[in-house]
């Protein structure tokens, strides 16, 4: 028998620093987790007392915070360098700014492969990208050879820009070609490794034949065996056991997000490759785990820049900037119309001809809205200025919801109205009138939105049976301020870029702002 | 067992540079920082720098910088210090230490012999 | 970066007795309830050798007569009972942060 120790992260999602136990900015120290530094500590550790370790990662190391803004992925490949990673796949994030921003940056620098088997170049690109990414990747490890396959989200077209050059095939389609040729090599144990969650993971476990263990990411899955860590909870056992349509039990990992865990997946091979057992547990990486030094001392090197950034201008408005408590918890607030335009044009992808976009509504908790920005400072608006708007760290996420969904989600909008709570929606590509002189759970009288399969968009009746896409906070897709119908009820949820980060770029694309009350919100009785 | 072998001692002129070397037998030498330090008589210990080889990272003192370049070959399990532009002041013993990490404490817990630089005119 | 204090200079203890050497850090070298401090062993002609790490822990092959304590700023070396072979120079080193530090020594001899 032959042990391998599979060391795994996903959806690292730029956190490089250390942070909170929510994944948020890192206040008491004694009490961070996560952040590179940990991890080289763990990983260095793991590498010396153990023979057979590959450290991997499953995708969507861009994307989230202030280090990727001005790092744009140089930060992912030094890091990752430095850790000495063995593989990485493509996740949907590592296109956010375009193919240019994933081969300058990462893919020419990276010391490592870095796979996805399911993306085929095409026209100019296809030269251009030869060999920076492969299908997979053979691997020596001790005195054998691991197969590691790639896999990333054929929904990234829809998630990210990766521009019409590139073509998402279906990922059981594209692996199993690549998984025979690794055979054909005489290559017996084989990992696949991907971006499309945890739902695609355990497919890809039971349908491509000759996988032995999938390492996924995308979904956030946290597995975990026995009493979890952390505030956590288990999607199921680590590793998750799927049987494959040829009989064979298939392991199938995720490690969360974050950098919070390391995944940690003992393999047990038999002579002829066959998966004899497998065990393990993501470790959490708390402060238990001191910082490397040495790492921590490049960490803050590197983070010089980054307090320079936050001060610079990256706009102006020429109109004072409403986030108030008093305004965008009790009616249209010209920061929310802001703030959902941007998230709007943060998604805006023509991938089909008889879309103009293949999203155009936004909701946004009024609560989530934490600081106005006057103008009269020469209308000058930092990173620093957006922080204290958004400063919880989230992300601005698409969600796939029945018409009837965003019908209850717009009651529980005012099922309380006047008490100055956060769940009073903002609005983007969305009409709503409410009246409320009616019961609570009665008050929307109007709700219509814009239409996306249309060349002139305009405004049509809500369809209680209609799926609708619909871009909004992820502290919404998770049920927060109490709207646990979006939670319960969505047909799809995939994560997005930092909302930070979507608001500033998209200042910086206006140069000028100066958004209105323009009547998206409405109430139907006279004293609103 | 663990073991450093540095290069034999070396007597220069002013403005030249010197590489030193330690050859690491008896551990993965991928995995474990090399420290470099500086001992002077009657100046202690000063420390140079690191280099950890499987990944070439490096951190170097302030103090050091631009005077001293690390590199490493993995292939040979050695690990090198080039000291440019000498002086005097450049007139020690050198040593390289493995950072050991039992507990993650970050301690050097093998050292070269030493090799000692003389520069003189 | 965080300097570090050795006292005495030099300490001349009979055979059998106790020698106390103390090292004083500028700010602390505790992170994540390990003090990162640790103490080498120098004589004439031959590289540091490591005694004790994280401040109480005696490095491989290290006699029991050596023992290390202290935590935030305030560190010590213990050696007792002292032998011949004691006489050396003595260093404390923080490794809690880039760059590391070392005490000035001290010169410890038989009285």
């Known amino acids: 028998a032959w042990e391998l120790t599979i060391l795994h992260t996903n959806d690292v999602h730029s956190r490089l620093e250390q942070t909170s136990e929510d994944s948020s900015k890192c206040v008491n120290a004694s009490r961070c987790m996560g952040g590179v530094a940990r991890l080289f500590t763990k990983v260095q550790q793991i590498r010396r007392a153990e023979p057979n370790v590959l450290l991997l990662d499953a995708g969507d190391q861009y994307q989230g915070t202030i280090w990727f803004t001005v790092y744009k992925g140089a930060e992912v490949a030094h890091f990752m360098n430095a850790l000495r990673y063995d593989a990485m796949a493509l996740g949907n994030h590592e296109f956010d700014n375009g193919v240019e921003g994933l081969i300058e940056p990462l893919l020419k620098e990276a010391k490592f492969p870095i796979l996805s088997a399911n993306i085929k170049a095409k026209g100019p690109l296809a030269s251009q990208i030869s060999g920076l990414y492969l299908p997979y990747k053979v691997l020596p490890v001790g005195d054998e050879v691991v197969g590691i396959v790639g896999y990333t989200s054929k929904e990234t077209p829809f998630l990210s820009n990766p521009g019409t050059n590139l073509v998402f095939e279906d990922e059981i389609t594209a692996l199993q070609p690549e998984v025979d040729k690794l055979k054909t090599l005489n290559v017996n144990k084989i990992i696949a490794l991907g971006h499309s969650g945890f739902e695609m993971d355990k497919l890809i476990a039971q349908k491509v034949r000759g996988v032995d263990v999938v390492v996924g990411g995308h979904s956030n899955t946290f597995l975990y065996t026995g009493n979890p860590p952390s505030k956590e909870v288990p999607a199921g056992k680590y590793p998750f056991i799927v049987t494959s349509d040829d009989g064979r039990k298939v392991p199938v990992v995720q490690a969360y997000a974050f950098g919070k865990y390391l995944g940690y997946l003992k393999i047990e091979f038999d002579e002829r490759g066959n998966v004899i057992s497998s065990h393990g547990n993501p470790i959490l990486l708390n402060s238990s785990i001191p910082e490397d030094p040495s790492i921590k001392a490049d960490i803050n090197k590197w983070r010089i820049k980054l307090d320079n950034y936050s001060t610079q201008e990256l706009g102006k408005t020429i109109v004072y900037l409403d986030g108030s408590s008093q305004s965008c918890r009790f009616r249209e607030c010209n920061m929310g119309n802001l703030i959902c335009d941007a998230m709007i044009n943060n998604n805006l992808r023509h991938t089909d001809e008889m879309f103009w976009n293949h999203v155009s509504m936004c909701i946004l908790n009024g609560g989530g809205i934490r600081s106005p920005i006057d103008e009269r400072n020469n209308g000058t608006i930092t990173w620093e200025n957006l922080a204290a708007v958004l400063p919880f760290g989230g992300t601005f996420d698409l969600v796939q919801l029945k018409g009837s969904t965003l019908k209850k989600a717009f009651e529980h909008s005012v099922h309380r109205y006047g008490q100055s709570t956060g769940e009073f929606l903002q609005v983007g590509g969305i009409h709503v009138v409410y009246d409320l002189s009616r019961k609570p759970g009665d008050r929307v009288v109007k709700l219509d939105v814009l239409c996306t399969k249309c060349r002139v968009p305009s405004y049509d009746p809500l369809k209680m049976d209609e799926v609708y896409k619909v871009i909004l906070p992820n502290f919404l897709a998770n049920g927060g301020d109490g709207f646990q119908m979006i939670k319960d009820e969505l047909l799809r949820h995939d994560s997005g870029d930092q909302d930070i980060n979507v608001v500033s770029t998209y200042i910086s694309k206006m140069k000028v702002i100066y958004p209105a009350v323009e009547g998206r919100i409405k109430f139907s009785t006279g004293s609103h | 067992q663990v073991q450093l072998q540095q290069s034999g001692a070396e007597l220069m002129k002013p403005g030249a540079s010197v590489k030193i070397s330690c050859k690491a037998t008896g551990y993965t030498f991928s995995n474990y920082w090399i420290e470099w330090v500086k001992q002077r008589p009657g100046h202690g210990l000063e420390w140079i720098g690191e280099i950890l080889p499987g990944n070439v990272i490096t951190n170097y003192n302030e103090k050091f910088k631009g005077k001293a370049t690390f590199t490493a070959d993995t292939s040979s399990n050695t690990a090198y210090m080039q000291l440019s532009s000498l002086t005097s002041e450049d007139s020690a013993v050198y040593y390289c230490?493995?950072?050991?990490?039992?507990?993650?404490?970050?301690?050097?817990?093998?050292w070269g012999q030493g090799t000692s630089v003389t520069v003189s005119s | 970066d965080i300097v570090l204090t050795q006292s005495p200079a030099s300490l001349a203890v009979s055979l059998g007795q106790r020698a106390t050497i103390s090292c004083r850090a500028s700010e602390s070298v505790d992170n994540y309830g390990i003090s990162f401090m640790n103490w080498f062993q120098q004589k004439p002609g031959q590289p540091p050798k490591l005694l004790i790490y994280a401040a109480s822990n005696q490095g491989s092959g290290v006699p029991a007569r050596f023992s290390g304590s202290g935590s935030g700023t305030d560190f010590s070396l213990n050696i007792h009972p002292m032998e011949e072979d004691d006489t050396a120079m003595y260093f404390c080193q923080q490794s809690k942060e880039v760059p590391f530090t070392f005490g000035s020594g001290t010169k410890l001899e038989i009285k």
């Open positions: 230490a493995r950072r050991g990490d039992d507990g993650y404490l970050y301690a050097m817990d093998y």
